[in-house]
Interface confidence: medium
Amino acid sequence: CDLPQNHGLLSRNTLVLLHQMRRISPFLCLKDRRDFRFPQEMVKGSQLQKAQVMSVLHEMLQQIFSLFHTERSSAAWNMTLLDQLHTGLHQQLQHLETCLLQVMGEGESAGAISSPALTLRRYFQGIRVYLKEKKYSDCAWEVVRMEIMKSLFLSTNMQERLRSKDRDLGSSRNDSH
């Protein structure tokens, strides 16, 4: 299963929306910065299997959807942009679920809970703890918005690497026939 061509576009749209959602200058929130320790080793590996990449992306999007799908986030952000974010994330999740089922049907095991899902859930729990600690202040949400943009950008890069790897494999198969 190829990651749908428009999946990359949807990911970029999500980044654009998160960028547009900015309400206050990050410079006003420097004192609230926190290192959430995004598990970069998950998205930087060179030996990425398709199922692993998809499971990382799926868990990432599921968690972002969950984070921005609460009463607290509804109070913090522009509702129109938030609705667009929800819709975009929902579409991406549906794409990925279709793809994942096909890949697993081909016998490639996602092994998802053992690494990506567990690690990412811990990372997002840290973000939720931080928001609670900071009493869901505007600055806390701004710090989280920036963090989500960073982690989503890294995950999108991983997706691009998988797509180019697929293209290379496709052309080498064509060469050998």
Epitope: T70, L100, A110, I113, L118, Q125, G126
Partner: antibody, heavy 123, light 112 residues
Framework: EVQLQQSGGDLVKPGGSLKLSCAAS????????MSWVRQTPDKRLDWVSI????????YYPDSVKGRFTISRDNAKNTLYLQMSSLKSEDTAMYYC????????????????WGQGTSVTVSS | DIVMTQAAFSNPVTLGTSASISCRSS???????????LYWYLQKPGQSPQLLIY???NLASGVPDRFSSSGSGIDFTLRISRVEAEDVGAYYC?????????FGSGTKLEIK
């Protein structure tokens, strides 16, 4: 009221197979991850397998990997555990359990358990 | 795998007094996100296990506030402030920090 009704336990010979079922009611089954946990005759709890809400991802400890398969049918609100190549050390009471995933907290704590179903592997 | 260690029996307690049950993990259960992934379950005689405590110190829904839990990341203690007859059973600690998730062997609460 959340309920997990289990069935399928039996006496089987070593090398045999068995399929356990866990019928869920009282909650939106498709929104929750599920696990199987077994309790050995010495009363130890041994976690056996886990499956995410949509059924896309599963995981097994080495002790059962390759022999046990967890699956779910969200349309039927049912969780399954297919056990094959059974060994005497698989003898236990098997429990299905729901993960506490409410409030977006995505935890793996098991907040509701079935009544258990007994599996005995003996010749 | 993370090993969870528990004593088989607690010190016998009198109804109405407090009881403590200990658990130790082979590795710190404190994650860099600030959460300690330690859980307590109670299995009453003839029943299935039930969740008491999640993430080291949070009471599960419906659990009386006589129960409390604390710890360091490796050493953990479950306290029952006023033991009642219905508290009898086996108490299991468990870790959800890493797969495979593992349980302690259980501690039976003994009443004098």
């Amino acid at each position: 009221e959340v309920q997990l009704q289990q069935s399928g336990g039996d006496l089987v010979k070593p090398g045999g197979s068995l399929k356990l079922s866990c019928a869920a009611s009282g909650f939106t089954f498709s929104s929750y991850g599920m696990s199987w946990v077994r309790q050995t005759p010495d009363k130890r709890l041994d976690w056996v397998s886990i499956i995410t809400s949509g059924g896309s991802y599963t995981y097994y400890p080495d002790s059962v990997k390759g022999r046990f398969t967890i699956s779910r049918d969200n349309a039927k609100n049912t969780l399954y555990l297919q056990m094959s190549s059974l060994k005497s050390e698989d003898t236990a009471m098997y429990y299905c359990a729901r993960h506490a995933e409410g409030g977006g907290n995505y935890d793996y704590a098991m907040d509701y358990w079935g009544q258990g179903t007994s599996v005995t592997v003996s010749s | 795998d993370i090993v969870m260690t528990q004593a088989a029996f607690s010190n016998p307690v009198t109804l109405g007094t407090s009881a403590s049950i200990s658990c130790r993990s082979s590795k710190s259960l404190l994650h860099s996100n600030g959460i300690t992934y330690l859980y307590w379950y109670l299995q009453k005689p003839g029943q299935s296990p039930q969740l008491l405590i999640y993430q080291m110190s949070n009471l599960a829904s419906g659990v009386p506030d006589r129960f409390s839990s604390s710890g360091s990341g490796i050493d953990f203690t479950l306290r029952i402030s006023r033991v009642e007859a219905e508290d009898v059973g086996a108490y299991y600690c468990a870790q959800n920090l890493e797969l495979p998730f593992t349980f302690g062997s259980g501690t039976k609460l003994e009443i004098k």
